[in-house]
């Protein structure tokens, strides 16, 4: 039975040209995380972190995506096109699969604040 919940950073905003941390956290389960997939709104994969193989960053994002902190992802050199939904998919053992959603808004304004409050989607 799947008892866990995915907490995410929810809706966040960051400055164009800046960086942002995408973070999900699996709680309320003893399940082991075997793999975490990070993908964009159009289903394209950004990065994968496998418990036994480590990180794999997709070639198209190699210059702008850094693994971590933890199972999270750091997106750098943000452009307006980075605005949209991001998803973390947690493959766990023995529970199964959990999925979380983050919405990132990239702002032109220099007053953009990066909010990183954890939310349960």
């Amino acid at each position: 039975m799947m008892t866990g919940t995915i907490e995410t950073t929810g809706n966040i905003s960051a400055k164009k040209g800046g960086s942002v941390i995408l973070q999900c956290h699996l709680s309320s389960t003893m399940a082991q995380v075997t793999q975490v997939n990070w993908e964009q709104h159009d289903h394209s994969l950004l990065a994968i972190r496998n418990a036994e193989l480590g990180w794999h960053i997709y070639p198209a994002f190699k210059d702008r995506v850094a693994p971590g902190p933890g199972l999270g992802l750091t997106l750098q050199s943000l452009t307006m096109n980075d605005t949209g939904e991001y998803f973390c998919t947690y493959h766990t053992y023995p529970d199964g699969t959990y999925r979380g959603r983050i919405f990132l808004e990239v702002l032109e304004s220099s007053v953009a604040e990066h909010s990183a409050r954890f939310q349960i989607p």
Epitope: Q32, Q35, E39, H43, A51, E52, L53, Y93
Partner: antibody
Framework: EVQLVESGGDLVKPGGSLKLSCAAS????????MSWVRQTPDKRLEWVAT????????YYPDSVKGRFTISRDNAKNTLYLQMSSLKSEDTAMYYC????????????WGQGTSVTVSS | DIQMTQSPASLSVSVGETVTITCRAS??????LAWYQQKQGKSPQVLVY???NLADGVPSRFSGSRSGTQYSLKINSLQSEDFGSYYC?????????FGGGTKLEIK
């Protein structure tokens, strides 16, 4: 060249046991997840078991859970499937397959070994 | 358990035609799907993984797509070597179920 060679298939009576082996070569076995898939006489493909690269995680469908055990010996580059309490519906060609890194699709398959469960 | 409904079960087509095979998942599997080809007397071979990624060495006339929970394999300008059986397989919730298969025959 990647090679997967299955062995151990046989004719066995219902309730019996059998152990299949799959010898792997041509790649770094210890860094790949591996699976067993069977093809029934009516040509349907059925996933049987999966084991992670290090052997820490094993997965089974309900149809074989508790009866079949997948294991691996990374020092010997060999994958195993221990089958017990065999039923007539387990009759099939059994393939071992390598999984794509970071994905679960199977990119290399062996030629298969035949298992017949009949009295 | 997630069910994969593959259609059609069989298809009779001519060389040069374009064919689309579909698999519908009973719930969202978020692109965790592969397509395989199997020729008579041979082992299956992967064509597409992660719904849209062409496996190494697979001709560009093959393509995978997704619309919601429906996944499609399209083969443009069928060649004689493309005839055989095709299967989809999902990878979600620690289960890896196959579709029922599609047999592609020469008309």
């Amino acid at each position: 060249e990647v090679q997967l060679v299955e062995s151990g298939g046989d004719l066995v009576k219902p309730g019996g046991s059998l152990k299949l082996s799959c010898a792997a070569s041509g790649f770094t076995f210890s860094t790949y997840g591996m699976s067993w898939v069977r093809q029934t006489p009516d040509k349907r493909l059925e996933w049987v078991a999966t084991i992670s690269s290090g052997g820490s995680y094993t997965y089974y469908p309900d149809s074989v859970k508790g009866r079949f055990t997948i294991s691996r010996d990374n020092a010997k580059n060999t994958l195993y499937l221990q089958m017990s309490s065999l039923k007539s519906e387990d009759t099939a060609m059994y393939y071992c397959a390598r999984q794509v890194h970071y994905f679960y699709a199977m990119d290399y398959w062996g030629q298969g070994t035949s298992v017949t469960v009949s009295s | 358990d997630i069910q994969m409904t593959q259609s059609p079960a069989s298809l009779s087509v001519s060389v040069g035609e374009t064919v689309t095979i579909t698999c519908r998942a009973s719930e969202n599997i978020y692109s965790n799907l592969a397509w395989y080809q199997q020729k008579q007397g041979k082992s299956p071979q992967v064509l597409v993984y992660a719904a849209t990624n062409l496996a190494d060495g697979v001709p560009s006339r093959f393509s995978g797509s997704r619309s919601g929970t429906q996944y499609s394999l399209k083969i443009n300008s069928l060649q004689s070597e493309d005839f055989g059986s095709y299967y989809c397989q999902h990878f979600w919730d620690n289960a890896y179920t196959f579709g029922g298969g599609t047999k592609l025959e020469i008309k």
